[in-house]
C-alpha cells in the first residue's frame, strides 16, 4: 500500500478580520493509526493549534466528523480571526505510541489577515499660532494588514503636498501603522477651515477612512484696534470707543488706561461673529470732561488669549470744545440710547 | 496528581433519579474527556457514555440513551452523571474515567459510586 | 454496534508462567483497542492503549500486539499482583464496548 500523505491543498489563505478561516488537510491512507494536530510555524517553537487527541481548543471545530475513524479530512475553522493569527499553518499527522511520534506533515498554508486600519487620529500643534506661520498636523491609523496603505491630506477640500509618511514596522509583522505629518500654513481666514487625513486600504472596499482637525483649535487671530470719539448731547461729555475687530479665540480683556492709569477693565462677553468665524466687540467710555484740566490720553489696552497686551490711544484735547474727531467705522456695533453721566460708566456689545 | 473524586453511595427506589458527580483534579479539565462505565455486580463493564469537558459534546449508548444526561460544570472542575427511571437492574457501580478525543482510553478512574436501587 | 469477544473467560497459572489474552472485535478495528486490569473491589487500571502502546508506569512483563479483528495481552512471568481480571476494549467507534473479561486466578 502507498504510503500516507498529507495533502493541504491551499498554499495560501487570505482571510478578513473578526471572519473565520478554513484550513484544508487531508491524508490519503488511515494507516499508521495515530491523531493530526495542527500547528503554527515549524521548528521547536511552533505552536500547537489543534489536536485531534486531546486538549481544548474553542475556537476550533474540526470541518467533518473527525470521530469517525474512516474519515480522511482533517480540515479545521478557526474563528475570529485576528491579525495575530497569520502564520503558515501545517496539518501534521502522528504515529501511535508512548509517546505518539510524527509520521508526516503537510506543506503548509499560509495565512494572511486582512486587517482594517482604525479611525485614523490627527492631531494639531499644542499652542495656538497666527496667521502666515506653519503648523504641523500628525495623523495616525493602526492595526491593519496587509502593509500597502495610502494616506492623502487636505485642506477644506484642496489636497495638501507637504507632508511625510510612515509605515510601521519595516519588516514583515501580523499587523501596521501609520504616521504621517504635514505642514499647513495658516490664514486669516482659517477659522472655520478643516484639515483632512484620508486613509484608503484594501479592506475599505474604496469606502475610505477620515480623521479631521479643525483648524479653530489651533489658529489664532489678533484683533486690530481702533479709538473713536463720538459726540455726545452734553457739553461736558465725551464718548470714546474702542473697536475690537477680527480677532479669534474669544478670549478677550480690554483695559482703559486714562493717563496711563487703569480706568476699568472688562472681559469680552457679548461680541458678534464674523462670517470668516472671527469677533468683533466694541467697548467704549463717557468721559467727563469737566473733571478733566489738562488733555487726556485714553489708551485701550487689549489682552488676547492671553497674549502680550496690544493698545490703541486717543488724545482728547479738554482745551477745546468736545467735537466729533473721528468716524463712527463701526457703527453697526452701536445701537444703545443708554447714557452715562460718570466717566467709569461704559457700554460695550 | 491527577484525581477523580466521585460522590458518596446512593439508595434509590424504582422509578427515581440519581445524580453522581465526579470532581477531577491536577490536569486541565478542558482538555479531555469523561466516560461513565458502569459495572453490575459480578458482570463486566459497560459503557454509558461521554462528554468532552471542553465544548460539552455529549455521546450516549443507545442502551441509555433517554434515561442518562451527562453534564459538566468547567468552573468546578466536575462532571455529572445523572440516570432517570431507576429499576432494580441499575443496582451498579458507577465509574467516571478521563480519556482522550483520539484513542478514547480511560487512563485515569474514579474509585466508583454504588448505587443501589430497591423497593 | 462493534461487538468484543474475549477468551478465555478465565484461566488458571503459576507465578513465572506465560500468560496470553485474547479478544476478537465483529469488525475491522484497525489499532484501537484497549485493556484494562481490575482488582476485586477497584477501579480498572490501564495497561495498553492502541492495541501495542505500554502505558506510562505499566511493567513491560506487559505488552499488546493485533490489528484488525485478532489481539492479544500477552503477560510474561506472571507475578502474585497479576492475578485480577484483564478486560479489552474496542475504541474504533462509539458505543465503545468491552470484552466480557478474563479473570486470572492462581493455579
Known amino acids: 500500500e502507498e504510503e500516507l500523505q498529507v495533502i493541504q491543498p491551499d498554499k495560501s489563505v487570505s482571510v478578513a478580520a473578526g471572519e473565520s478561516a478554513i484550513l484544508h488537510c487531508t491524508v490519503t491512507s488511515l494507516i499508521p493509526v495515530g491523531p493530526i494536530q495542527w500547528f503554527r510555524g515549524a521548528g521547536p517553537a511552533r505552536e500547537l493549534i489543534y489536536n485531534q487527541k486531546e486538549g481544548h481548543f474553542p475556537r476550533v471545530t474540526t470541518v467533518s466528523e473527525s470521530t469517525k475513524r474512516e474519515n480522511m479530512d482533517f480540515s479545521i475553522s478557526i474563528s475570529n480571526i485576528t491579525p495575530a493569527d497569520a502564520g503558515t499553518y501545517y496539518c501534521v499527522k502522528f504515529r501511535k505510541g508512548s509517546p505518539d511520534t510524527e509520521f508526516k506533515s503537510g506543506a503548509g498554508t499560509e495565512l494572511s489577515v486582512r486587517a482594517k486600519p482604525s479611525a485614523p487620529v490627527v492631531s494639531g500643534p499644542a499652542a495656538r499660532a497666527t496667521p502666515q506661520h506653519t503648523v504641523s498636523f500628525t495623523c495616525e491609523s493602526h492595526g491593519f494588514s496587509p502593509r500597502d496603505i495610502t494616506l492623502k491630506w487636505f485642506k477644506n477640500g484642496n489636497e495638501l503636498s507637504d507632508f511625510q509618511t510612515n509605515v510601521d514596522p519595516v519588516g514583515e509583522s501580523v499587523s501596521y501603522s501609520i504616521h504621517s505629518t504635514a505642514k499647513v500654513v495658516l490664514t486669516r481666514e482659517d477659522v472655520h477651515s478643516q484639515v483632512i487625513c484620508e486613509v484608503a486600504h484594501v479592506t475599505l472596499q474604496g469606502d475610505p477612512l477620515r480623521g479631521t482637525a479643525n483648524l479653530s483649535e489651533t489658529i489664532r487671530v489678533p484683533p486690530t484696534l481702533e479709538v473713536t470719539q463720538q459726540p455726545v448731547r452734553a457739553e461736558n461729555q465725551v464718548n470714546v470707543t474702542c473697536q475690537v475687530r477680527k480677532f479669534y479665540p474669544q478670549r478677550l480683556q480690554l483695559t482703559w488706561l486714562e493717563n496711563g492709569n487703569v480706568s476699568r477693565t472688562e472681559t469680552a462677553s457679548t461680541v458678534t461673529e464674523n462670517k470668516d468665524g472671527t469677533y468683533n466687540w466694541m467697548s467704549w467710555l463717557l468721559v467727563n470732561v469737566s473733571a478733566h484740566r489738562d488733555d487726556v490720553k485714553l489708551t485701550c489696552q487689549v489682552e488676547h488669549d492671553g497674549q502680550p497686551a496690544v493698545s490703541k490711544s486717543h488724545d482728547l484735547k479738554v482745551s477745546a470744545h468736545p467735537k466729533e474727531q473721528g468716524s463712527n467705522t463701526a457703527a453697526e456695533n452701536t445701537g444703545s440710547n443708554e447714557r452715562h453721566h460718570h466717566h467709569h460708566h461704559h457700554h460695550h456689545h | 496528581q491527577v484525581q477523580l473524586v466521585q460522590s458518596g453511595a446512593e439508595v434509590k427506589k424504582p422509578g427515581a433519579s440519581v445524580k453522581v458527580s465526579c470532581k477531577a483534579s491536577?490536569?486541565?479539565?478542558?482538555?479531555?474527556?469523561m466516560h461513565w462505565v458502569r459495572q453490575v455486580p459480578g458482570q463486566g463493564l459497560e459503557w454509558m457514555g461521554w462528554?468532552?469537558?471542553?465544548?460539552?459534546?455529549?455521546k450516549y449508548s443507545q442502551k441509555f440513551q433517554g434515561r442518562v444526561t451527562i453534564t459538566r460544570d468547567t468552573s468546578a472542575t466536575t462532571a455529572y452523571m445523572e440516570l432517570s427511571s431507576l429499576r432494580s437492574e441499575d443496582t451498579a457501580v458507577y465509574y467516571c474515567a478521563r480519556g482522550d478525543y483520539y484513542y478514547y482510553y480511560m487512563d485515569v478512574w474514579g474509585k466508583g459510586t454504588t448505587v443501589t436501587v430497591s423497593s | 454496534d462493534i461487538q468484543v469477544t474475549q477468551s478465555p473467560s478465565s484461566l488458571s497459572a503459576s507465578v513465572g508462567d506465560r500468560v496470553t489474552i485474547t479478544c476478537r472485535a465483529s469488525?475491522?478495528?484497525?489499532?484501537?483497542l484497549n485493556w484494562y486490569q481490575q482488582k476485586p473491589g477497584k477501579a480498572p487500571k490501564l495497561l495498553i492503549h492502541?492495541?501495542?502502546s505500554l502505558q506510562a508506569g505499566v511493567p513491560s512483563r506487559f505488552s499488546g500486539s493485533g490489528s484488525g479483528t485478532d489481539f492479544s495481552l500477552t503477560i510474561n512471568s506472571l507475578q502474585p499482583e497479576d492475578f485480577a481480571t484483564y478486560y479489552c476494549?474496542?475504541?474504533?467507534?462509539?458505543?465503545?464496548?468491552f470484552g466480557g473479561g478474563t479473570k486470572v486466578e492462581i493455579k
Open positions: 491536577g490536569y486541565t479539565f478542558t482538555s479531555n474527556a
Open positions: 492502541a492495541a501495542s
Open positions: 469488525q475491522s478495528i484497525s489499532d484501537f
Open positions: 476494549q474496542q475504541s474504533y467507534s462509539t458505543p465503545l464496548s
Open positions: 462528554i468532552k469537558a471542553g465544548n460539552a459534546e455529549i
